[in-house]
């Protein structure tokens, strides 16, 4: 067995094993997506988070899972069975994914100001129509999740929520914000926790949540809430995690480039040593 043959054999099984791993990963992601779609309640209790934008994530996870499984399957079968058409398709899919990521990166960096303005418009529109339109649930749940995770409230300030009639209290107690703004770590006051927050948090996980204002979780804006707007919170988060984000993007890109190189190398060299390589299958 020549050096070239053993090298190709190594590449073949390396591609197979790695793509098998990604196939399993993709199927896990897909299963999570389906789990959320079928049974939201048990997923919420499993994850232990009240503010998970389930509706949107179920679809995102399911689609991502299928996509990952699809590409990985092409790589797996193409490498193992030494099928040039599948390896070529695998290379093409990875190239398309890589090109999309590069394009997105360029667009984000060049259109940053426009993108920021668009995000602000979207967020403020989501806040204004909070719990009034059943079709907007995904956006609202996603925004609740952002507030909860980034420990912020509103876009500019918590006061962004004061125009939302459905959250408003009576007369002098008008200023209220959603429970995702509530700073659980800052309170020792068990009364507000026991009577207001916890019962409503547990209810947030359920699929069949009515649209009545009585069923909307809101807290006084003067109590233990996050006082920073999410525009600042988002900037802080991006600033603090910039190295990680760039690192992950570079890592994913290099991984894709690596797999593309290996697949095209295997694809091109299958002709020369096809018969001899077949012995080691």
């Amino acid at each position: 067995m020549s050096a070239q043959e053993s090298c190709l054999s190594l590449i073949k099984y390396f591609l197979f094993v790695f793509n098998l791993f990604f196939f399993v990963l993709g199927s896990l992601i897909f299963c999570f997506g389906i789990w959320i779609l079928i049974d939201k309640t048990s997923f919420v209790s499993f994850v232990g988070l009240a503010f998970v934008p389930l509706q949107i994530w179920s679809k995102v996870l399911a689609i991502s899972g299928i996509f990952t499984m699809g590409i990985a399957l092409l790589g797996c079968v193409g490498a193992l069975k030494e099928l040039r058409c599948l390896l070529g398709l695998y290379f093409g899919m990875l190239l398309l994914l890589f090109a999309t990521q590069i394009t997105l990166g360029i667009l984000i960096s060049t259109q940053r100001v426009r993108l920021e303005r668009r995000v602000q418009e979207l967020v403020l529109r989501t806040i204004q129509s909070y719990r009034t339109n059943p079709d907007e649930t995904a956006a609202e749940e996603s925004w609740d999740y952002v507030q909860f995770q980034l420990r912020c409230c509103g876009w500019h300030y918590p006061q962004d929520w004061f125009q939302v009639l459905i959250l408003r209290g009576n007369g002098s107690e008008a200023h209220r914000v959603p429970c995702s703004c509530y700073n659980l770590s800052a309170t020792n006051d068990s009364t507000i926790l026991d009577k207001v927050i916890l019962p409503q948090l547990s209810r947030l996980g359920h699929l069949a949540r009515s649209r009545h204002s009585a069923d909307i979780c809101a807290v006084p804006a003067e109590s233990h809430i996050y006082r920073e707007g999410c525009a600042q919170g988002l900037q802080k988060w991006l600033h603090n995690n910039l190295i990680s984000i760039v690192g992950i993007c570079l890592g994913v890109g290099l991984l894709e480039l690596g797999f593309m190189t290996l697949s095209i190398f295997l694809c091109r060299n299958l002709d020369h040593v096809y018969n001899r390589l077949a012995r080691y299958r």
């Epitope: 500019h156 300030y157 006061q159 962004d160 004061f162 125009q163 408003r168 007369g171 002098s172 008008a174 200023h175 700073n183 800052a186 309170t187 006051d189 507000i192 006084p220 804006a221 003067e222 109590s223 233990h224 809430i225 006082r227």
Partner: antibody
Framework: QVQVKESGPGLVAPSQSLSITCTVS????????VSWVRQPPGKGLEWLGV???????NYHSALKSRLSIKKDHSKSQVFLKLNSLQTDDTATYYC?????????WGQGTLVTVSA | DIQMTQSPASLSVSVGETVTITCRAS??????LAWYQQKQGKSPQLLVN???NLADGVPSRFSGSGSGTQYSLKINSLQSEDFGTYYC?????????FGGGTKLEIK
Amino acid sequence: QVQVKESGPGLVAPSQSLSITCTVSGFSLTTSGVSWVRQPPGKGLEWLGVIWGDGSTNYHSALKSRLSIKKDHSKSQVFLKLNSLQTDDTATYYCAKGGYSLAHWGQGTLVTVSA
Amino acid sequence: DIQMTQSPASLSVSVGETVTITCRASENIRSNLAWYQQKQGKSPQLLVNVATNLADGVPSRFSGSGSGTQYSLKINSLQSEDFGTYYCQHYWGTTWTFGGGTKLEIK
């Protein structure tokens, strides 16, 4: 029902510190903000600052360096301290329930800064 | 800081008339505005919050309106107890400010 009452020294010498106590009843300091506002004789209202339910504070930007607001939950009291007083700090000092709009006001305490 | 400009500074009106007081902010305050009434020698009283929301116990002849930077308080058929000084106050951002006040006097 909600009650808010300020108690202050009345007369303070220039360059000294002013301390006013606001005693509240009928609501919890953990869920409500308490604001401080002053009104110089014959003039308009000036917002000084607020202490929120969680103890965090917002201050008037021009007074930030010499103003501090604290509270004691157990005594249901909020404290205002203003350092390095000048004659133009002469005013009626009000404390009010509410951090955003001020729903219940105390009767105010007149503080005169004079030698 | 955001500046609040109130107009007019003073107003002489008869009982039964309708009056409108305006308040202009130096930037968009997104309806985070309150109106107060203060009578001579007394503490201010909240009338309206969130620009349009009537506070507890405030008569329906009072109404607030506006958005962005322009706001107004309207008092329909003035009563004798409505005379005094009116202040607007914004609570957008992290520091609040009051308007200069509008003194409402009996004609």
